[in-house]
Interface confidence: low
Amino acid sequence: EICGPGIDIRNDYQQLKRLENCTVIEGYLHILLISKAEDYRSYRFPKLTVITEYLLLFRVAGLESLGDLFPNLTVIRGWKLFYNYALVIFEMTNLKDIGLYNLRNITRGAIRIEKNADLCYLSTVDWSLILDAVSNNYIVGNKPPKECGDLCPGTMEEKPMCEKTTINNEYNYRCWTTNRCQKMCPSTCGKRACTENNECCHPECLGSCSAPDNDTACVACRHYYYAGVCVPACPPNTYRFEGWRCVDRDFCANILSAESSDSEGFVIHDGECMQECPSGFIRNGSQSMYCIPCEGPCPKVCEEEKKTKTIDSVTSAQMLQGCTIFKGNLLINIRRGNNIASELENFMGLIEVVTGYVKIRHSHALVSLSFLKNLRLILGEEQLEGNYSFYVLDNQNLQQLWDWDHRNLTIKAGKMYFAFNPKLCVSEIYRMEEVTGTKGRQSKGDINTRNNGERASCESDVLHFTSTTTSKNRIIITWHRYRPPDYRDLISFTVYYKEAPFKNVTEYDGQDACGSNSWNMVDVDLPPNKDVEPGILLHGLKPWTQYAVYVKAVTLTMVENDHIRGAKSEILYIRTNASVPSIPLDVLSASNSSSQLIVKWNPPSLPNGNLSYYIVRWQRQPQDGYLYRHNYCSKDKIPIRKYADGTIDIEEVTENPKTEVCGGEKGPCCACPKTEAEKQAEKEEAEYRKVFENFLHNSIFVPRPE
C-alpha cells in the first residue's frame, strides 16, 4: 500500500499503527514528540521499504533502535528534503543505535544526527555507501565514541563477520549494531544493488532486490516504477509522479493539491504530473490540465488579502515572485540587506501594474527604484490620505527614482508626495512629474524643496516620555503631545528601538551609506484626538533584555534659517520583565559510589532573568538490558570509560587540566588559545545549529487542534 502524502506521528506512540500496511510512504515520515517512554517491541513494520521524501525523528522517549521498527527500510529518496536533509535524528534521548541495517540508499540530501545523548554506532557506519556525498552530513552532539565501545559482530570472538572500509584514513569494520553488519555489494556489481546472496540486481533496481538481474524483483527503483516493473523512463501515456512512479492521465486528473491554493487540480507538463505549471508556462485555459508557454513574462495577478503588502525584507518580496499585476498597495520599507537591489529585482522586477498606491518610506538601503524595472502603471484606485498614490518619505540614500530616458510610467490617479529624501534631487522629482503625467496635480507642500536633495535637518525641541510599562516581551511607552507652531504641520512620530546591553548607544549607531541601521523603526500616526498622548506597544521583544528607545516627531514647519524644525526625545533605557528560562544545557551524570550520583549541567542559553535556583528531579529506572550484550571480561575490547572534553571528572580539578602539548617543549601545559579563524568557525557553527533548530521547531510545532 502506498501511504501519503506524508505521515506525522506525534504525542501517542500507538499512532504508529498507521504504518501497518505501508510499503512505500509517498511523502515524509515524522515520528516526534512522544514524551512518555513506551515499549516499542510490539511495533514492527517489515513492509515499509521506501520513503520518497525524508525521515525525521525528534524527541521520542524510550525508542532505543530503529532496526526493529523498520527492518526493511531500504531507500529514502529525498525528493523533498527537511532543511537539506533526508534523514534527521534529533534529541532522541534513549536511542542507542540507528540500526537501519537494510538502509542502502539515500538518493538525495544529507543526514543530520544531532543531540542524541545515548546514541552509538555512528562511527561504524560508512555513509558513503549510502549517500553520493557525505560532506554535508552533520553528526554532532551524540554520545562520545570513547564512551560507546562500538563492537561489530564477531569481533569479540576474534571472528569478525563484517566487511571493512576506510573512513578518514581509518580502515575498520562496518556495522549498524552489535549483531548487524552494514551490507556491501561485490565490486563486480559496480553501482548496482545486490541480493542478500551478493548477486547483482538489475541496473534499474535501487537498494536491493529479491532476485538477480530482474527488473520486476527490485525492492525500489533507480528511476521510475510502473505496473510492477522498474523502468528508466515512463512509458507512453503515463507521466512521472512524485519523482518515483508513473501514473496515467486519469490518476493525475483526480489528485488535488495539498499545497497549491490554486483551485485547479494537477497538470501534465513535460511528461510529469505536477501541482502547477513550471516557471514560464501557464495553464491552457482555466480547467485545462496542460501548460503552454507564456508570451514574455507569464501574467500573474497577485492580491494581498490585507490590501497593503509591506515589503520589508527579501523574504516578503519573495511572495511577489512572478507577479505582473499587483492588486493592492505596495509599502516598501527596506532598511538593510545584502545585495538588496538585485534580490528585489529578482522578486519584484516583473510587476507592471499596481492597482492602488506605492509608498516608499525609511528604505535606507535603497539607492534607486530601478528594481521595479517593469513598472509602467500605478492606477491609484486606492490612495493614501491626502489623495497620494505615490509617496516617498525618509529614504536616506535614495538618489535616483528610475532612468527616465528609458522609462514610461503612468500614474493614472492621485498625487505624489516627497519629503526627507536628503540625497534625492528635486530635479529628479520634477522629471517624474512630467513622465508620469502628474504635473499640476501636486500642491506646494507635496514636493518639499528644502528637505529633498539637501542634507540639512535639525531637531530643536525635546519630546518627554510620560509613562512606561513593561512585561516579559512588551514595552508600552507614551510621550507628550508635541505641538509645533502650526499643529497641522505635525505629520507623525517615529519610534526607534534596539537591544542595548549597555547604556552607551547613540542615535547614529549602525547607520551607514549602504543602508545598514541597527535601530528598529516604527511609525506612529497622530492620535485622532488632540488631547490624547501618543504612544506605542512594542511587542515580540526578548525577556529580561535592556532596550534603548527614542522618539522623533516628523514635522513640516520651517524656522528662520530654513532648517527643518522637529522634535526628538532623549534615549530611554528600559528592561523587559523576566520570564521562564530555557532548559539547562549539557546535563551529565556520573556515579562516584554505589549510592551517589554527581549531576552537572550548564546554565540555560536563555536565562530570561536572574537565575536563583535549579530544581533537580530524579527517579529510579529499570536496569538497561543493553549493558549485558557485551562480554566486558574480554581483555582490551572495550575502551576504558573516559569523559569527553567538556564533560566532568568525578574529582574536582584542582590544578591546571593537563591537555595537549603545545610549542616545542614536551610536558604538561595549557591548551593553545584558539585562533581568530577557529573562533569564527565556532561562531558560525553555533549560528548554523541555532538556525536549524529554529527551523525544526517552526516546522513541527503546530497549535493543538481547537
Epitope: E1, C3, G4, P5, Q15, K17, R18, N254, I255, L256, S257, A258, E259, S260, S261, D262, S263, E264, G265, F266, Q275, E305, V702, P705, E706
Partner: antibody
C-alpha cells in the same frame, strides 16, 4: 457514478445503541475522508467527525466524543458510525459525505452526500 | 469553536430578482496552509445538501454562473442573480478550516 448509499431508518429505545452504514461506490474509497453530519428536525447541520479509510485515523467534534464511534471496512468500501447511550436529543437525520484525502487542500469540500439515515429515539 | 452567523434567517424573493445572503465567522477562517475553506450548500426539502461554492468564490462543477461567492477574513456573501424556482431552499455556509468544522444556521429562500 459516485454514490454514498446509507442504511435505512432506525427506531431505537433510549439508552440503546445503533450502528448506521454508508456504502461508497464509483470512486477510490481510500482517497477520501468519510465525514458524518447531523441534522436535527428543522435545524441546521452539525459536523460530527471524519475518518481516514487508509489508517482508521479519526477527528471528532468534541461535542460528539463518546457519543459516536467511526469505523471503516475497506474490503466492502463501507463506513460505519455507531451511536451509543441514545436520548431524544439524538433523534435526527445523519448524513455521510466524502472529503478528498490526498493532496486535498485546494478542494476540501463535501462534494458527494449520502441519502441520509433517520434515527428516531423513542420509548 | 468557530461560530458561523447567517443573515437573514428568511429571505422572501421574486423570481428573476437578485438575492444576497451574508455569513459572518466569529474568527478568521484562513487555514494554516493559506486557503480559506468557506463553502455554500443548498438543501432542498427532503434532499441532501448540495455543494454550490467552495473556497469562498469557486463555483463547483455544474453550478450555474448565477451563483457567486465573495468575501475574506470573517465576512462572506453568496449572491444569486436572476432567481429561478429551482434555487429555492435553505442555504448554509460552512467553514472547513478549523476543527470542529461548523455550519451557519441557514437562510431560507422563499417566494414572496
Amino acid at each position: 457514478e459516485v454514490q454514498l448509499q446509507q442504511s435505512g431508518p432506525e427506531l431505537v429505545k433510549p439508552g440503546a445503541s445503533v450502528k448506521i452504514s454508508c456504502k461508497a461506490s464509483g470512486y477510490a474509497f481510500t482517497d477520501y475522508y468519510m465525514n458524518w453530519v447531523k441534522q436535527s428536525h428543522g435545524k441546521s447541520l452539525e459536523w460530527m467527525a471524519n475518518i481516514n479509510p487508509n489508517t482508521g485515523g479519526t477527528n471528532y467534534n468534541q461535542k460528539f466524543t463518546g457519543k459516536a464511534t467511526l469505523t471503516v471496512d475497506k474490503s466492502s468500501t463501507t463506513a460505519y458510525m455507531e451511536l451509543r447511550s441514545l436520548t431524544s436529543e439524538d433523534s435526527a437525520v445523519y448524513y455521510c459525505t466524502r472529503w478528498i484525502l490526498y493532496y486535498g487542500s485546494s478542494k476540501w469540500y463535501f462534494d458527494v452526500w449520502g441519502t441520509g439515515t433517520t434515527v428516531t429515539v423513542s420509548s | 469553536d468557530v461560530l458561523m452567523t447567517q443573515t437573514p434567517l428568511s429571505l422572501p424573493v421574486s423570481l428573476g430578482d437578485q438575492a444576497s445572503i451574508s455569513c459572518r465567522s466569529s474568527q478568521t477562517i484562513v487555514h494554516s496552509n493559506g486557503n480559506t475553506y468557506l463553502e455554500w450548500y443548498l438543501q432542498k426539502p427532503g434532499q441532501s445538501p448540495k455543494l454550490l461554492i467552495y473556497r469562498v468564490s469557486y463555483r463547483f462543477s455544474g453550478v450555474p454562473d448565477r451563483f457567486s461567492g465573495s468575501g475574506s477574513g470573517t465576512d462572506f456573501t453568496l449572491k444569486i442573480s436572476r432567481l429561478e424556482a429551482e434555487d429555492l431552499g435553505i442555504y448554509y455556509c460552512f467553514q472547513g478550516s478549523h476543527v470542529p468544522y461548523t455550519f451557519g444556521g441557514g437562510t431560507k429562500l422563499e417566494i414572496k
